[in-house]
Amino acid sequence: ESGYAQNGDLEDAELDDYSFSCYSQLEVNGSQHSLTCAFEDPDVNTTNLEFEICGALVEVKCLSFRKLQEIYFIETKKFLLIGKSNICVKVGGKSLTCKKIDLTTIVKPEAPFDLSVIYREGANDFVVTFNTSHLQKKYVKVLMHDVAYRQEKDENKWMHVNLSSTKLTLLQRNLQPEAMYEIKVRSIPDHYFKGFWSEWSPSYYFRTPEINNSPGEMDP
C-alpha cells in the first residue's frame, strides 16, 4: 500500500486508463455472495487483464475473478463482510490499479418482481403490490423501494414514490381517467448496507377506468 503516490492529482492519474466500478450482491445464490466489476471505459482492451480481490476474506488471502465477456465476476461464500478489500486490475501478475472497497458499501439488490396493480372500486384507489427476494435474506433485508409510474403518452414524466414496504396505494383522483399507465419499481439498501439501485422490475401496464367501473385486477 505504501508505494502509492500521496499527491491527489497523481493518485487519480494512476487510475485513469483502467478505471473500474464494482457492485456486490449478498446471498444472491443461496448463501453465496457475488462481486461484479467492469471497466468504466467500454473501449478498454481487456485481453490479458485480470481482476483479483485480496483482504477481508475468510480462509483465503486472495480470490481471482472469472471473466464473462466484458465483466469480471466472483461467486463465493468467502467474503468476511467487515473491513476493506483490495480489488486490483492485473496484467501478468503486475497490478495496474487498485481500489480499497468495503463490500457492504457497494451492494446492489436484486430487482423486485411480481409487480401488479388492482383497482378497488369502492375505495376509488389502486393497490400496487410487488415482491422482493430480500424478504427471505439474512443480510440485506431492509430496502427502500422507488415506485415510478407515468401515463404512457408522457415519455419522460415519471412520478416517483419512495416506500419501505411492498405495498402502495395510489388514489384514483390523482390519476387521469381512461388512461394507460406504466409502472415499475427498483430497490436500494436502507439499513447499514449501502450501495446502488437495483435494476428496474419489469414494467406493469394498467388502464384507469372511467369514473364508474367494475372492480378486480386491471388488465395488463
Epitope: 502509492y4 500521496q6 491527489g8 493518485e11 468476511l80 463482510l81 473491513g83 476493506k84 468495503d102 447499514y192
Partner: antibody
Amino acid sequence: QVQLVQSGAEVKKPGASVKVSCKASGYRFTDYELHWVRQAPGQGLEWMGGIDPKTGGTAYNQKFKGRVTMTSDRSTSTVYMELSSLRSEDTAVYYCARSGGRWYFDVWGQGTTVTVSS
Amino acid sequence: DIVMTQSPDSLAVSLGERATINCRTSESVSIHLLHLMHWYQQKPGQPPKLLIYGASNLESGVPDRFSGSGSGTDFTLTISSLQAEDVAVYYCQQSIKDPYTFGGGTKVEIK
C-alpha cells in the same frame, strides 16, 4: 509504516474555537475514512464524527452537530477537526483514527490535548 | 443511541490466568453472522489499540491469547493467559448505528 501524526496541545478560552490537524502517511490517503474520537480526563471514549478524504463527505455525531467541522486536504494528506463554542466540558484528548472498516479504528494518532479554561 | 454496558468495571487476575470481560448492548449489533462489535486496549498515556474487530477477528499483530466471541447483544473479550503487558483498560465499541458508541471500559490489573 502507517502513521497518523497530530498537532500539538492547545489551551483555549470558553467560547473560542480550536482546530486540530492529523497528517496521514504510509498508505494511500483516499483509501480510508478518518474519524475523531475524544477522551475527557479519566473518562471513556466518545466518537465525534468522520470524513471520507476521497469525497469530502462527513458524518457527525448529532451531539456535536453545528459545533464541529471536519475537512481534508488531499495535497498534504491531512484532515482537520474544528470545534467551536468551546466550554470546559470540551477539555479532553482528541484522537484521529483511521477506519479499517465500518466503523472500527485500526490506526490511531498520538492524541492532542485541548484544555478549555478561563 | 446504543448504550454499551461493560462488566466488570475492574478485574484483578493472576499472571497466566484467564481474564474475561463482557459487553452488553441496548439493542442488537448483529446482522446475521456480521457482528459489529470491536475491542480496544488502552494503556496509560497512549491511544487505544484495536485488538478484535467484527466480534471475533484478531487484528494483525495482536497475540492470539486475545479472543472475542458473542452475537446480538452479548459479547466477550477473553485473555486466555494474562501477561504483565496486558495491564490496561479495555473498551468495546459498536458500529451498527451512528453514533458509534463505546463501553465505559474495564480496568485489568494483576492480582
